[in-house]
Amino acid sequence: CDLPQTHSLGSRRTLMLLAQMRRISLFSCLKDRHDFGFPQEEFGNQFQKAETIPVLHEMIQQIFNLFSTKDSSAAWDETLLDKFYTELYQQLNDLEACVIQGVGVTETPLMKEDSILAVRKYFQRITLYLKEKKYSPCAWEVVRAEIMRSFSLSTNLQESLRSKE
C-alpha cells in the first residue's frame, strides 16, 4: 500500500497549522518545559512499512483526541482547529486504507501492539501534564511544541519509508 503524495502534503500542512496556532509569546513558558518521553525507538525500530502504519495511525489518532477536547477548544483558535481536524482526519483515512488492505496483518503483531501501547502511554503523560498544569496557556504551548516535534519525527519516518521503497 502506497500512501498518496497528498499524505505528505497533508503532514506538512498539519505542521504549518500547529505553528500558526500559537497564542502567546513562548519565552515566558521556559519554566514549564517537560520531558514527555516520546517513544522515538518505536518509530525507528520498525523496518517495514507494514509495521509502522498502525503505529503512525495511533499517533495521529491520539493527536486528534488530544486536540478534540473541550479544554483544547478553549485554548486554540476555532478556525485553525477546524482546519487541523480536517488534515488529521484525511491522514487517518489514508492510513486506514492501508490497514484495511491487510498490510502487515500476519507480521509481528506483538511488536506492533507494544509500540501502540508505548504511543498511548506517551499521550497519557501529556494529558496528565496538562491536567497538573490546569490547562494553562503555557502548558498548552509546551504541548503544542512537543506535538510539533514528535509529529515531525514520525512524518520523517514516513518519508524515509517512501524513499526506501
Epitope: S25, F27, L30, R33, F36, V142, A145, M148, R149
Partner: antibody, heavy 121, light 107 residues
C-alpha cells in the same frame, strides 16, 4: 552536520551602524530559537536576547533592550544582531547559539564561531 | 532577573585531581541549569544540561547535580584539556543569565 556560521570581524567608528549575521545549516532553522551572547575582552558571558525565527518573536535582556535589534530571515536561515549607533563599549566578541525552544532538549547546544566587533575612533 | 553566583571564581588544580565548582541561583530554577566550558579564543561548549544530563560527546568524567537553587559541576579526574573557564547558566526564565565564570588553572 549542524552549523552556525557567523559573519566576519568588523572594525567600526563610534556612531556607525552595524548588522552581523548567523547562518544556520544542517537542521530545521525554524524549529530552534537563536540566542545572542556578548563577551567583552577578558570578561564573562552575557545573554543579550533571543529570537524565534518561525515568527520573529524576540525577548531581550533589560541591559540590551533598546541598544540592539535582533531579527531573522527564515527564507535564508539567518539571524541578525544590529546596532544603529555603535559605542566604544560595544567592542566585544558576539556569539550566536541555538536553543530548542520549549522542547525538552539541550539548551545552546551549537554555537557560532563568534564575530569580533571593534569600535574605535 | 535571576542572579547566578559561581564559586570559586578561580582555582588551581593538578592533572588527576577531583574538581568541584558550585553555582547558586537567587531563586529556585528547578533543574533548568546548564554548564559550559570555554577555552581562550573559542566559543563556549555545552557540557551539562538540565542540571545533570551529559551532553552527547562530552567525557563521562564531567557530571552535574543539584536542583532548586544549588548546583554542582564535578570533574572526577582533571585532564590537561580540561583547563578552561566554566560557566553555569539558568534557562528557567528570561532574561537567561550566566554565572561570572570559574577559571580552572594548572597548579
Amino acid at each position: 552536520e549542524v552549523q552556525l556560521v557567523q559573519s566576519g570581524a568588523e572594525v567600526k567608528k563610534p556612531g556607525e551602524s552595524l548588522k552581523i549575521s548567523c547562518k544556520g545549516s544542517g537542521y530545521s532553522f525554524t524549529s530552534y530559537w537563536i540566542g545572542w551572547v556578548r563577551q567583552m575582552p577578558g570578561k564573562g558571558l552575557e545573554w543579550m536576547g533571543i529570537i524565534d525565527p518561525s515568527d520573529s518573536d524576540t525577548a531581550y535582556s533589560p541591559s540590551f533592550q533598546g541598544q540592539v535589534t535582533i531579527s531573522a530571515d527564515k527564507s535564508i536561515s539567518t539571524a541578525y544582531l544590529q546596532w544603529s549607533s555603535l559605542k566604544a563599549s560595544d567592542t566585544a566578541m558576539y556569539y550566536c547559539a541555538r536553543h530548542p525552544g520549549l522542547n525538552w532538549a539541550p539548551d545552546f547546544d551549537y554555537w557560532g564561531q563568534g564575530t569580533l566587533v571593534t569600535v574605535s575612533s | 532577573d535571576i542572579q547566578m553566583t559561581q564559586s570559586p571564581s578561580s582555582l588551581s588544580a593538578s592533572v588527576g585531581d577531583r574538581v568541584t565548582i558550585t553555582c547558586r541561583a537567587s531563586q529556585s530554577i528547578n533543574e533548568f541549569l546548564n554548564w559550559y566550558q570555554q577555552k581562550p579564543g573559542k566559543a563556549p561548549k555545552l557540557l551539562i544540561y538540565f542540571a545533570s544530563s551529559l551532553q552527547s560527546g562530552v567525557p563521562s568524567r564531567f557530571s552535574g547535580s543539584g536542583s532548586g537553587t544549588d548546583f554542582t559541576l564535578t570533574i572526577s579526574s582533571l585532564q590537561p584539556e580540561d583547563f578552561a573557564t566554566y560557566y553555569c547558566q539558568q534557562s528557567y526564565s528570561t532574561p537567561l543569565t550566566f554565572g561570572q565564570g570559574t577559571k580552572v588553572e594548572i597548579k
